[in-house]
Each structure stands twice: as C-alpha cells, then as structure tokens.
Amino acid sequence: LRKVAHLTGKSNSRSMPLEWEDTYGIVLLSGVKYKKGGLVINETGLYFVYSKVYFRGQSCNNLPLSHKVYMRNSKYPQDLVMMEGKMMSYCTTGQMWARSSYLGAVFNLTSADHLYVNVSELSLVNFEESQTFFGLYKL
Amino acid sequence: LRKVAHLTGKSNSRSMPLEWEDTYGIVLLSGVKYKKGGLVINETGLYFVYSKVYFRGQSCNNLPLSHKVYMRNSKYPQDLVMMEGKMMSYCTTGQMWARSSYLGAVFNLTSADHLYVNVSELSLVNFEESQTFFGLYKL
Amino acid sequence: LRKVAHLTGKSNSRSMPLEWEDTYGIVLLSGVKYKKGGLVINETGLYFVYSKVYFRGQSCNNLPLSHKVYMRNSKYPQDLVMMEGKMMSYCTTGQMWARSSYLGAVFNLTSADHLYVNVSELSLVNFEESQTFFGLYKL
C-alpha cells in the first residue's frame, strides 16, 4: 500500500512542534504513523515531503516568521532542518495581514525518522484544514 | 498510462472558476479530462494536486487576495476547498506590485470528482504559462 | 533505480545560472547528472520539478525579484521558461527583509534536456541548504 500522509491544522496546538489533525476531514494516513506532532517513517526510501503554514494577524508588527520541516532520529544528537522558510518586513505596520509559507522537496528518509513542523510564532498561525497542512508520500 | 495534467493560464476569460489552456505550449493532459475549467478524475486513487497563481497590479491598494483549489462532485451538495492561500497587506500603497501563491498536496480523489481553481480577483491575475498553472498526477 | 535529484544552495555561485551543492549534506543525485548548474535528463518521461529560493537583504529597496526554472536543449535555439515567480513591492523601504519563492510542477522532459535555475539578483540570495534548493524526480 502507498505510504502517504496529509495532516491538517489543529487549532489546539499549544507548543512546538505543531500538532496535527490525523483523523477527521481531508486527512490521509497510510503506511506512516503519527505520534505527538510527528510523522514516523517505517520504511527507508525516497519521500516527497511538503508543508504549508498560513500566518495572519490583526495588526502588523512584522514579527519575523519562520516555518521549518525538520527531522529527528534517536541515532542523531541534533534535529536536522530539511526545509525552511523565513519572512521579515512583509506587511504594513498596523494593518490586518495574512501570508502563507510553502515548502516541498524530496528526501531520503530512514525507518524511525520522525518529521515535524515548527513555526516561530504559534499565535499567528491559522489552522484551517485548507490553509495549514503537512504531508508526504513515498516515491 | 500515467494520469497527469499540467494546464497553463488562459488570459481571455473572465469567468470563475479559472479556465485553462489545455492544448498548446507546455501543457500535459493524459488520463484526465478537462471540462469548463475543471480537471475531471476518472480513476479513484491518490493524487498530488498543485497550482500557482501570479497576481500583479499597477498600483497597490492591498486588495485581499485568495487562491483556492476546490473539488465538486454531484454526490455532494457543496464544494470542498482542498487548499487555499490568502494574502492581505502585501505591498506598498500606490506601487506596482507582483506576488505568487503556490499550493500543492496529496488527496484521495474519486472517479467523477471535478477539480477547479478560484481566485478572489481575476483582474489581478497574470496568465503567462510559466507563472500561472494547475496540475496533478496520480501517485 | 528511481531518477531523482535534490540539490542545495552553493554560496560561491558568482554567475547565472545558479550553481548547486551536489555532494554534501542532504543532497540526492541518482539517475540524473549534474553539470555546471544544470540537471541533465538522461531518460525521457514525466518529471516533477521544483525549486525554492530564499531572498533576503539588509535594507529593503524593493528591487524586483525573479526566480525561474528553465530548460535548454541543443535542438532548440532558445531557453524555455518552465516556471517563474516574480516579486515587486514586497517589503518596507529601509528595513531588513526576507522572502521565499517556491515553484513546482510536472513536465514532459526529453533525454539531454538541461534544467537550470535563474534569479534576477544573485546578491540577495541566501544559500542555506534548507532554504534554497532545486530538485526533481521521475514519476
């Protein structure tokens, strides 16, 4: 069976990494496990990994924004940042604003790798399922 | 044969959903039908769906922009928004501006699903084939 | 073996097209050759091609930014722009700024096609491996 995941925003995320909806709506989870915000790889191979995060706020103060997909494996001491997007000076001071960050690329993943998404400012993330998501599929 | 589509911007249309070039240029259409702006799925399965829209204008007034990929099926009463990007407060008032929105993710699609792209303001879309496009492929 | 590439930013790029790290880090190169900034296709077929470029600067002057993936083949006299992103009026004058451009789509590529990435302003590109990359895989 095709190894695939598409998880959507979960608005009760309170800490990093982001947590995801893995059951309801347009979610997919097949041949990959979801555990505490992470997608857990159980078969080594090539995967296309992607994520989109929708940032928005009532009054722009140009707080620097970052959106990272990173990997953790018990064999390695440190997280590996696979993909990252950063934004600075992106809106007009005081105005209501909205902006997305999209990441997607191919990686060679190993069984037991855990993949997570991190953002710099949780309070500025909107978690609508169509707007903020995290997924992958095995090539 | 691989089920795949890559359609490019078609500039002489004023209707929603967006209409697409399905014949000339860098277009691909194989195992999927194109009908009145929509990609029509004829085989149930997992698909990676993507779209990019290039917005631009002569004089920025920060009109809110949205870019949606949505699905319609006669079995369901309402359109399902699969992916969406929104932008607010994205340029300096009065200046010439340009910005893109990119969406891409995996979905489980069913035979007879129709996929479309919608934008909030058609007048601000540039339809160059390299800039505005809509595609998918079956995993 | 799966034909796949994921190349990351190389900070000693001095000219166009961009040059890429093809050996160290989270790089992948299998069944595709890398030559002077280009990915060289050796088997005709359908490929998903993607690139992200991270632009940033110390003091915003809203220099127009462009990010292109283009194709060159000795059979054709001219480069073919496959995908392109443009940005104008994207930051507040004088401020430190940062912004990404992401492109990704499916193309029918032919053996001996060379794929490259071009940007309008090399001095504004940040080449961190997680931020600026170029890849593809055969469907």
């Epitope: - | 500039s11 002489n12 249309s13 004023r14 929603m16 002569q58 007034n61 009109l63 809110p64 949205s66 934008v119 909030s120 303001e121 058609l122 007048s123 601000l124 | -």
Partner: antibody
Amino acid sequence: QVQLVQSGAEVKKPGSSVKVSCKASGYTFTRFDISWVRQAPGQGLEWMGWIFPGDGSSQYNENFKGRATITTDKSTSTAYMELSSLRSEDTAVYFCARSLISTAMFDHWGQGTLVTVSS
Amino acid sequence: EIVMTQSPATLSVSPGERATLSCRASKSVSTSDFSYIHWYQQKPGQPPRLLIYLASHLESGIPARFSGSGSGTEFTLTISSLQSEDFAVYYCQHSRELPRTFGQGTKVEIK
C-alpha cells in the same frame, strides 16, 4: 496613471440615439471590466451594464436591456455606450468606470458626459 | 435585485466631529470570504470616488479618517474627524450579484 476620458456633451431629440465614448489609458484595457453608470440631475447613481474587453462579453441592467448597447474597440482602448429610443427621462450624466472583474468596485471613473434629451 | 437603503438622507455635522453613515442591503451581500459592499464620495460636478471597498478596506490614497465596517446586510461608513473637504454625498454600492445597485446617497453637510 489610469485615465478614462469621455466624449463631450450631447443634445438629442426624443426617439433618437446617442453614442458616448470612453478612452482608457494607463492600464491593460483587456483585463478589467468597463461599466456604465448614469446619474439624472439631482438624483443618485444607476448602473447600466458592463463589458469585458478581453472577450467582448457583456451584461446589462434589465432596465436598459434592448435600449443600451455597450461595445469596445481594443485597438484604441475605447469603450462605447449607445442608448436608443431616447426619452426626456434619459437626460443624465453618463459615466464610464473601470471595474475589477470579481470584486466589481469602480476604482476609476471618467469625467462624465451630459446627455440632454429635449424636443 | 438587492435594494440598498442609506440613512440618514442628510447628516449635519460640524468640522472635527465624527460622522456615521449607514447602509442596509435587502439581503446579505457577504460570503465566507468577503462582504461585497463599496463606498464612494461624490462632490458637485465630479465623478464619484472610491473610498472603501469590500466593506472595510481603504482604497489607495484615501485618508485614514475614513473607515468601513459591517457584514451581512448592515454596513457603516465612519469619518472620524470631518474635514472641510469631506462635505459631499456618499453612496454605498453592492457587487454581490447583478444588477449592481447603489444606495440613494447620504448628504453630509456643514452644521
């Protein structure tokens, strides 16, 4: 900058026709609608219809269907509004306005053309 | 068609004071994304000028003392501190469907 320049004032007899022009400049003519809006003396604004120069498609207010015809000439970036079977109550200032397709607000206006219908 | 009703017909305000103009639609002009209501200012002998679009967004070049609010069928244009150049007629317009219709206008005059 965006400009819409209309033709001059007209005096017409009841039963006749009038054709008002609106020359656009400073933007891509084929990417925005042109609407026509009229204003009778001392009265409010009444939308008559729009045309999309890109493909020539148009829509009219039911109140003007059959009497108003909106056309464009892409080569000169000019829109036209012809109103036939004129009556005294058609005396008004006629404005052309650029309209965004989807949002449909009128962001740039012509200076107006006074059409007087009198015997 | 959607009927737009503005109130009051005339508003007498002193310079420096706040002015609040109302516009009611006969049915909802809002979607999940936007409220399709726009406000214009017209002075004698001039074409209308766009002030606010999509209920609350300030058009480029319009002073920040103008603001718009509302959703569904009830909308408000507020001028926080009237300047001499603000005395004019104000129209609301919807673009939710065809035909586009305008309110009958509110005249803001000097008290």
